[in-house]
């Protein structure tokens, strides 16, 4: 057979040949970082001629072209500079908002050598919608400008850019957009390992957190009971072994998967791992139905024994069959455990697909994904029970659209990635679960299943009491510190007599702790403004208690996430460079923010935190409170910007004994404390000894009920001063380096 000509050099780059100059050989070009090859490859045809995939005309000279990042197509409610058609590597684009709009995301973004922008989409939002403004990523066009419950927005990419993420999103009842942010990227772009590792890792650690990590397995316990107690994770690893995957690549796939398995077993969760290699047909090396799938040594052994030659007779890429074998495994397990049982329904499923290209046989893999979603009953409520990560390796033949179609779409997360080569994949797996350092005290995980106890739903909630009667509530913010209100300690009684009850006082989980030290804000003085006719003033109503021992983490005792910390950043699944301001913009992101506090009887009650102009009207009614504030001229003397305000509409009001407890929000199935209960105009428990009885204020009451909570975003310096060694705090805001 004729060989292909050898005049195929690329100026400024290099090339490799899969099978020399013979027909069937694939010539692959590569360029230095910041440049990309055009064309990317050529194939030696049996005629002895080179063919360029997708090219219409005959052989053109191969060149290394400069990578560029896409320009904004439109930017709402603000301006961006400079305005270019596309941006060179290292180039910046800056965003500013019009008056009345707050900038969420990155004010300055830089074009990176892989053709992708750093930071996150800049959005100018006024917080008026039920959902936050979803923004328009660079290079995208959005249709749909209403952000109310049920409203939809659609995205497409300009020119030849490829869309990854969701092309359509819907504003859901919980104020979160369905799916994941769409990104428009150059067809030749790929992801850097340092971006993929934290994205994969935080998504994974969230899932591990939701699986209730720290329950040690008691060997004597029946396994099904154990699954019911603390959830279970099925991890399915799918390794491409088709012809285009070299033996070297396959070895690194194996090493990467082994690393993943090793890390996953280091979390104290119940996990079963399935291993499937595939080419034209799948080969199940380990099934979740096999008891050995729970044994790390056995799983790694099955990976170790995976042989590159297992698939030498069928060399296509049948991704459908690989995913379908996962579906069949799930089906068998469901039949075994029983479709209606908690043992089946509480299993979370994660699929990691490692592939080097597009499926070329067996039909659409999307069909298998649809079957999997169906069998697991994945809907908005159960969205967290399935994660599919689609990871393409090698820039050449990877089909972005197919990967994107297969990967899960979740708000604030990415599940589809393309890496330059298998070594980059290995780097990702080496670093993706470094967050394991944090999992022992993983924050903000509450059990949300219907049969969970109150304490399991809010495991951070603690009761603070002197020797006699109960007085205050508080929140665990680490394994040894409790955040509460300063006014609980205003009688100055010796705190050595006080006790903190952690876990449910009504069960064996409840445990009394002594207080090693109380740190009460020096600024708190209830009588500070007495001579201004303000009989009680609650500025700086914040205190920290250090417990005499560390709390053993369990499903009944676990810290809540404090915003502006690295721990909360992971739980929010935000990028690494995030700031305290970013957290505030994300958590308090509209004019009425749904939140909760915990009642005396342990149940979770609902409030709405009023922001912006609504905060002003919420606080204004304090002027009608003539007993406490006889001659008040300025409401802001009492309600400073340290306070969050609730109590309008259908809000519940906290009772006296609920002071110091957390005011918290739920985001992405995790819980974040934004405030603490301080004071109010109405006590619904007045005159009742029954913890379960609360009286709503009559509609005609003057002043109407209002409740004020210390805003933790306004207490950052004090929190940092005392918790700097306990939590990892983020910078307060971005420091911009303008490049001129």
């Amino acid at each position: 057979a004729p060989s292909c000509p050898q005049n195929v050099n690329i100026s400024g780059g290099t090339f490799t040949l899969s099978h020399g100059w013979a027909p069937g050989s694939l010539l692959t070009y590569s360029c230095p970082q910041g440049l990309y090859p055009s064309p990317a490859s050529r194939l030696c045809k049996s005629s002895g001629q080179w063919q360029t995939p997708g090219a219409t005309r005959s052989l053109s000279k191969a060149v290394c072209k400069p990578v560029r990042c896409p320009a904004p197509v439109s930017f709402e409610n603000g301006i961006y500079t400079p305005r270019l058609g596309s941006y060179p590597v290292g180039g910046n684009v800056s965003f500013e908002c019009e008056d009345g709009f707050i900038l969420r995301g990155s004010p300055v973004r830089q074009c990176r050598p892989n053709g992708m922008w750093d930071g996150e989409t800049a959005v100018c939002d006024n917080g008026a919608g039920h959902c936050p403004n979803p923004g328009i990523s660079l290079g995208a066009v959005r249709t749909g400008f209403r952000f109310g419950h049920g409203d939809k927005v659609r995205y497409r990419c300009s020119s030849n850019l490829v869309l990854t993420g969701s092309s359509e999103r819907e504003c859901q009842g919980n104020g979160v957009w369905s799916g994941t942010e769409p990104i428009c990227r150059q067809p030749y772009s790929y992801d850097f390992p340092e971006d993929v590792a934290p994205a994969l890792g935080t998504s994974f650690s969230h899932m591990l957190g939701a699986t209730n990590p720290t329950q040690k397995t008691k060997e004597s316990l029946g396994r099904k009971i154990q699954i019911q107690r603390s959830g279970h994770l099925n991890l399915y690893l799918l390794l491409d072994c088709s012809q285009s995957v070299s033996e070297n690549d396959f070895l690194i796939f194996k090493e990467s998967a082994s690393l993943m398995v090793d890390r996953i077993f280091s979390f104290e969760i119940n996990v079963s791992v399935a291993i499937i290699t595939f080419a034209s047909e799948p080969k199940v090396l380990m099934s979740v139905l096999n008891d050995n799938s729970r044994d790390m040594t056995e799983v790694i052994s099955s990976l170790e024994n995976a042989n590159y030659k297992d698939h030498e007779n069928g060399t296509g890429t049948n991704t459908y069959a690989a995913l379908n074998s996962v579906y069949l495994m799930m089906n068998n397990q469901m039949r075994l455990l029983g479709m209606e049982t908690m043992a089946w329904q509480e299993i979370r499923h994660a699929i990691i697909l490692l592939t080097d290209g597009k499926s070329n046989m067996g039909g659409s893999p999307k069909t298998a994904v649809d079957h999997i979603r169906e069998i697991l009953n994945i809907n908005q409520k159960r969205n967290d029970y399935l994660d599919i990560y689609a990871i393409g390796v090698g820039k050449l033949d990877v089909d972005w659209r197919e990967l994107n179609e297969l990967g899960s779409k979740k708000d604030g997360e990415r599940h589809a990635f393309i890496l330059q080569d298998t070594k980059a994949l290995h780097q990702v797996f080496e670093h993706m679960l470094d967050v394991s350092k944090l999992t022992d005290t993983i924050c903000g995980v509450g059990n949300m299943s219907a049969n969970a106890s109150d304490q399991e739903r809010t495991p951070w909630h603690v009761t603070i009491k002197p020797k006699s009667q109960e007085t205050c509530r508080g929140a665990l913010i680490s394994d040894q510190w409790v955040l509460t209100a300063a006014h609980c300690f205003r009688d100055g009684n010796d705190h050595s007599l006080w006790r903190v009850n952690v876990g449910d006082p009504k069960s064996q989980w409840g445990k009394e702790f002594l207080i090693e030290k109380a740190v009460i804000s020096p600024g708190f003085d209830v009588f500070a403004k007495k001579n201004q006719g303000i009989l009680e003033f609650y500025g700086d109503d914040i205190a920290l208690l250090k417990l005499a021992q560390k709390v053993k983490m369990s499903t009944h005792a676990r810290p809540i996430c404090l915003p502006c910390t690295m721990e909360a950043n992971l739980a929010l699944r935000r990028p690494q460079g995030s700031t305290c301001r970013d957290h505030e913009n994300e958590l308090l992101n509209k004019q009425s923010v749904p939140a909760h506090f915990v009642a005396l009887n342990g149940s979770k009650l609902n409030i709405n935190l009023k922001m912006g102009v609504e905060w002003t009207s919420c606080a204004e009614v304090v002027s009608q409170e003539k007993t406490m504030f006889p001659n008040l001229t300025d409401v802001r003397e009492v309600v400073t910007d340290q306070f969050l305000c609730s109590g309008t509409q259908e809000d519940e009001s906290p009772c006296k004994g609920e002071s110091g407890g957390a005011v918290f929000l739920e985001r992405r199935f995790r819980f974040f404390q934004v405030g603490l209960v301080s004071w109010g105009l109405y006590n619904p428990c007045l005159g009742s000894a029954d913890k379960n009885s609360r009286k709503r204020a009559p509609r005609s009451k003057v002043p109407p009920p209002r409740d004020f909570h210390i805003n933790l975003f306004r207490m950052q310096p004090w929190l940092r001063q005392h918790l700097g060694d306990v939590l990892n705090f983020l910078p307060l805001h971005h420091h911009h380096h303008h490049h001129h």
């Epitope: 070299s246 070297n248 690194i252 194996k254 040594t297 790694i300 170790e304």
Partner: antibody, heavy 119, light 108 residues
Framework: EVQLLESGGGLVQPGGSLRLSCAAS????????MMWVRQAPGKGLEWVSS????????NYADSVKGRFTISRDNSKNTLYLQMNSLRAEDTATYYC????????????WGQGTLVTVSS | QSALTQPPSVSVSPGQTATITCSGD??????VSWYQQKPGQSPVVVIF???KRPSGIPERFSGSNSGNTATLTISGTQAMDEADYYC??????????FGGGTKLTVLR
């Protein structure tokens, strides 16, 4: 501190047998790929054999196939090399080395044990 | 015959940069480790996974690997760096492959 300590070397006649051991400490032995590498006096390094973390996968250099057997006891954190039908050309310092999880990416070496095959 | 090719010797003046190469088919697809061996001592890992330096190894040691060639670079070479250097990777079917070794001489 991660350590590998070889033992069992010595003088043996051609055709004889010897069993080398390598005691591992300072890391989770059962998770890693292990191997034996040898170095004849004044020569370069030569890979001899390797074994997967569970012991299920073994590989040998052509020069020792059928004569040497690699094994491991994860409960004792020990790697072994059973050497039979020894020849003069097997004379070398034998090193035990720790690899990755399934790859032979060596990152720790032992101090070696000398095997002399001579009549 | 070794599947990895190294130059038998490299000489360098103190303070200069020494470069030792290791070539093999599609080596860039694999991970390469580099070992330093001084007379009478066991080998020591100076670079693994192409570019990683174990703790305790000076920063002047660095590695790279692409195409068919891996390179060990010692910048600001010192007399104590005089030793034999070996590269290593894996071959097909689970075997391990070593280069023939390079004797680095630091000129006096």
């Amino acid at each position: 501190e991660v350590q590998l300590l070889e033992s069992g070397g010595g003088l043996v006649q051609p055709g004889g047998s010897l069993r080398l051991s390598c005691a591992a400490s300072g890391f989770t032995f059962s998770r890693y790929y292990m191997m034996w590498v040898r170095q004849a006096p004044g020569k370069g390094l030569e890979w001899v054999s390797s074994i997967g973390s569970s012991g299920g996968t073994t590989n040998y250099a052509d020069s020792v196939k059928g004569r040497f057997t690699i094994s491991r006891d994860n409960s004792k954190n020990t790697l072994y090399l059973q050497m039979n039908s020894l020849r003069a050309e097997d004379t070398a310092t034998y090193y035990c080395a720790k690899g990755g999880m399934v790859l032979g990416v060596v990152n720790i070496w032992g101090q070696g044990t000398l095997v002399t095959v001579s009549s | 015959q070794s599947a990895l090719t190294q130059p038998p010797s490299v000489s360098v003046s103190p303070g200069q940069t020494a470069t030792i190469t290791c070539s093999g088919d599609k080596l860039g697809e694999k991970y390469v480790s580099w070992y330093q061996q001084k007379p009478g001592q066991s080998p020591v890992v100076v670079i693994f996974q192409d570019i990683k330096r174990p703790s305790g190894i000076p920063e002047r040691f660095s590695g790279s690997n692409s195409g068919n060639t891996a390179t060990l670079t010692i910048s600001g070479t010192q007399a104590m760096d005089e030793a034999d250097y070996y590269c290593q990777t894996w071959g097909t079917g689970g075997i391990q492959v070593f280069g023939g070794g390079t004797k680095l001489t630091v000129l006096r």
